[in-house]
């Protein structure tokens, strides 16, 4: 069943205790209840599993990948789950923890010390389903180990958006990824309006920035479905 | 800040339906994804539902799956959590929570930051 997949993963995939984004007394909001964390050899439990569903990696943490829990499960069933460590199987790059990228199905370390000078790394990207690789375009694309010490700049190569500077994100360009700004107020940017929506773009568009969402344009209500124009707008 | 505020709890027979809401005000909530837990007298605080920013995923604890659904409507910023066929066992106390926005914000971790103030869900038998 599901939710003994969820608890068997639910010391791996919870996060550490909350900081700062609790609600003020007397508002309608308080901090979270609890969460598993980790305290010394034992986990206590101040509450139990909280699953976090996603349709797609961005919505999940940098340490976590979006995926179905359960082999060949429900595809309307995905969660935000604990990223693989090194040596550990994988379909895509996500699914490795930051410092690791997925090489013929297993997570390997992206160090300095795991290079020769340049690797040749394969960027496979599926269309319809993120998760495989059988069916999807495979283009070879150098990597210099450097971007993994020095924060991409725009335009760099990259994995995953923490291999970027402040104000990038890694999105895709053509068959591989590059840091791109991320999206200021007014700019166009991206809804995905289905499921796997994402897996079809050639140019990725980064997210909204801090305190922007991204919404119909709202000159572009009338308009129809398919040509409503989005824009990154404050909350 | 988000606010959350959970609406339609009541007293209902065993087999009986009842409509959760959870309406966001302060920030609009698009990008969040959204779940409700419950807490019944005397035990933990557990997970019922949840649904993702864009509405595309879902996950129920299995002993709601096939009675519960949780659904959203962006452009209201609200949840819902339609309950069917109710239980006596489902008595709680119904939270709505708001999770943020993942790695785009920066977290190693998705997580639900807010939380509301509950709403009671008495199932008589």
């Known amino acids: 069943t599901l939710n003994s997949v969820l608890n068997s993963n639910a010391i791996k995939n919870l996060p550490p205790p909350l900081g700062g984004a609790a609600g003020h007394p007397g508002s309608a909001v308080s901090a979270a209840p609890g969460i598993l964390y980790p305290g010394g050899n034992k986990y206590q439990t101040i509450d139990n599993y909280q699953p976090y569903p996603c349709a797609e990696d961005e919505e999940c943490g940098t340490d976590e990948y979006c995926a179905s829990p359960t082999r060949g499960g429900d595809a309307g069933v995905q969660i935000c789950l604990a990223c693989r460590k090194r040596r550990k199987r994988c379909m895509r790059h996500a699914m490795c923890c930051p410092g690791n990228y997925c090489k013929n199905g297993i997570c390997v370390s992206s160090d300095q010390n795991h290079f020769r000078g340049e690797i040749e790394e394969t960027i496979t990207e599926s269309f319809g389903n993120d998760h495989s690789t059988l069916d999807g375009y495979s283009r070879r694309t150098t990597l210099s180990s450097k971007m993994y010490h020095t924060k991409g700049q725009e335009g760099s190569v990259c994995l995953r958006s923490s291999d970027c500077a402040s104000g990038l994100c890694c999105a895709r360009h053509f068959w591989s990824k590059i840091c791109k700004p991320v999206l200021k107020e007014g700019q166009v940017c991206t809804k995905h309006r289905r499921k796997g929506s994402h897996g079809l773009e050639i140019f990725q568009r980064c997210y909204c920035g801090e305190g922007l969402s991204c919404r119909i344009q709202k000159d572009h209500h009338q308009a129809s479905n398919s040509s409503r124009l989005h824009t990154c707008q404050r909350h | 800040e988000v606010q959350l505020v959970e609406s339609g709890g009541g007293l209902v027979q065993a087999g009986g339906s009842l409509r959760l809401s959870c309406a966001a005000s302060g920030r609009t909530f698009s990008s969040y994804a959204m779940g409700w837990f419950r807490q019944a007298p005397g035990k933990e605080r557990e997970f019922v539902a949840a649904i993702s920013s864009s509405g595309s995923s879902t996950v129920y604890a299995d002993s709601v799956k096939g009675r519960f659904a949780i659904s959203r409507d962006n452009a209201k910023n609200t949840v819902y959590l339609q309950m069917n066929s109710l239980k006596p066992e489902d008595t709680a106390v119904y939270y709505c929570?708001?999770?943020?926005?993942?790695?785009?914000?920066?977290?190693?971790?998705?997580?639900?930051?807010?939380w509301g103030q509950g709403t009671q869900v008495t199932v008589s038998s």
């Open positions: 929570a708001a999770g943020n926005g993942g790695r785009n914000y920066g977290h190693s971790r998705a997580r639900y930051d807010y």
